[in-house]
């Protein structure tokens, strides 16, 4: 029961996390204009991974896509790649984990297969979460570097009457969404891996030995009972695989004001 709960919770947490990673990737507010010196501005700039936007005090918002691929900074391309890899891995992980869920029966799928699939999806979620966290962190680092560079530039070359204001950018909402979503996906993945261990208790390997007559030598292989012991086929209700066994009778079944682009 605890295994099913852990697996189910891991799946739900990962699902929320991946939805968050997708949302963060699509959001335009990865970096937003720093309003420290001017909290109320007539023109507000913010940028995403795919386009940059300007919201005027009039209420009009204009967004322009980055239509160039080669002209974009390598760091931005790297962040895009990390986020997309995170989404793809997460999506595959979700697909795999649906079939791995203990409360869902698919034909005569063995518990060993479910355990393997649970572990696979768990690892995928962990990598997906790490990709998202890495992507967001790289972007945040890029912002911090640029912020201090532009701050230094603000106080240079101000000779005479004319001042040129350089727009500084700070962390946007998407970064926080990305960090939280990546963390949730990571936690979900860990929970799936824990659930996998519960699906495959290792003590079953030892119980399998007790069925045989005394005096008959049995070569125990730590990897499980896939290797033949010379006793023919396995007992009907036992599913033996690398890492443990489980009886079939233990299985429980559970039924967006003016925007223009």
């Amino acid at each position: 029961m605890a295994v099913t709960a852990c697996q189910g919770l891991g799946f739900v947490v990962s699902l929320i996390g991946i939805a968050g990673i997708i949302a963060a990737t699509c959001m335009d507010q990865w970096s937003t204009q720093d309003l420290y010196n001017n909290p109320v501005t007539a023109v507000f700039n913010y940028q995403g991974l795919w386009r940059s936007c300007v919201r005027e005090s009039s209420g009009f918002t204009e967004c322009r896509g980055y239509f160039t691929l080669l002209g974009l900074p390598a760091m931005l391309q790297a962040v895009r790649a990390l986020m997309i890899v995170g989404i793809v891995l997460g999506a595959i992980g979700l697909l795999v984990s649906i079939f791995a869920l203990k409360c869902i029966r698919i034909g005569s799928m063995e518990d060993s297969a479910k355990a393997n699939m649970t572990l696979t999806s768990g690892i995928m979620f962990i990598v997906s979460g790490l990709c998202a966290i890495a992507g967001v962190s790289v972007f945040a680092n890029m912002l911090v570097t640029n912020f201090w560079m532009s701050t230094a530039n603000m106080y240079t070359g101000m000779g005479g009457m004319v001042q040129t204001v350089q727009t500084r950018y700070t962390f946007g909402a998407a970064l926080f969404v990305g960090w939280v979503a990546g963390g949730l996906t990571l936690i979900g993945g860990v929970m799936m891996c824990i659930a996998c261990r519960g699906l495959a208790p290792e003590e079953t390997n030892y119980k399998a030995v007790s069925y045989h007559a005394s005096g008959h030598s049995v070569a125990y292989k730590p990897g499980g009972f896939k290797a033949s012991t010379g006793f023919g086929s396995n007992t009907k209700n036992k599913k033996i695989y690398d890492g443990g066994a489980r009886t079939e009778d233990e299985v429980q079944s559970y039924p967006s004001k003016h925007d223009y682009v």
């Epitope: 023109v43 913010y46 300007v54 005090s57 209420g59 204001v165 004001k257």
Partner: antibody, heavy 118, light 113 residues
């Protein structure tokens, strides 16, 4: 067509308050910010502040902060500008103006003359 | 606050001749986000409210005759009336639309010589 109709001329004593109205028609009232600009006799234009009719948020010129209050009545598509603690130098024509692309003012009211005299 | 300085204060031009009005801002009005200059030009005739001519420094409002054109970037801007007509006699104002408080230039009075 877009129309901004302002209330009539006012004569006030120093220290009093004046409330000027601006009724909008011919467009979606909540879709455009409304600004107030004044012009003293023979002088230039001076921006006082604006109000977002959708959220009710305001931005005021620091010069008038504490003296000016902008409000809206969505039911009648009307914007109000109240200026308190009137002084003789507040004698001016007060305009309401709709904000457009580039934060420019594309439509203006006919103006309301406010005279502050003892 | 951004200070807008217009020159000249007044301008007398013959009918059909070119009129040029300059506007200088104390800070750049160029927004890096969309590379647009947040400067607006208005025309005001006696006893009337101002009328929008040009926004984003060079974008003419629909209905405005094409003899009116705006140019410039950053801190220096120009309004040009290519061929002055009698109905163009008015006071012209430039406005900073980039940073609060929104500020206007002192105005340039255009007359017929």
């Amino acid at each position: 067509q877009v129309q901004l109709v302002q209330s009539g001329a006012e004569v006030k004593k120093p220290g009093a308050s004046v409330k000027v109205s601006c009724k909008a028609s011919g467009y979606t009232f909540t879709g455009y910010n409304m600004n107030w600009v004044r012009q003293a006799p023979g002088q230039g234009l001076e921006w006082m502040g604006n109000i977002d009719p959708y959220y009710g948020g305001t931005s005021y010129n620091q010069k008038f902060k504490g003296r000016v209050t902008m409000t809206i009545d969505k039911s009648t598509s009307t914007v109000y500008m109240e200026l308190s603690s009137l002084r003789s130098e507040d004698t001016a024509v007060y305009y309401c103006a709709r904000m457009y692309h580039g934060n420019a003012f594309d439509y203006w009211g006919q103006g309301t003359t406010v005279t502050v005299s003892s | 606050d951004i200070v807008m300085t217009q020159s000249p204060d007044s301008l007398a031009v013959s009918l059909g001749e070119r009129a040029t009005i300059n506007c200088k801002s104390s800070q750049s009005l160029l927004n890096s986000g969309n590379l647009k200059n947040y400067l607006t030009w208005y025309q005001q005739k006696p006893g009337q409210p101002p009328k929008l001519l040009i926004y984003w420094a060079s974008t003419r409002k629909s209905g405005v005759p094409d003899r009116f054109s705006g140019s410039g970037s950053g801190t220096d801007f120009t309004l040009t009336i290519s061929s002055l007509q009698a109905e163009d006699v008015a006071v012209y104002y430039c406005q900073n639309d980039y940073s609060y408080p929104l500020t206007f230039g002192g105005g340039t009075k255009v007359e017929i010589k």
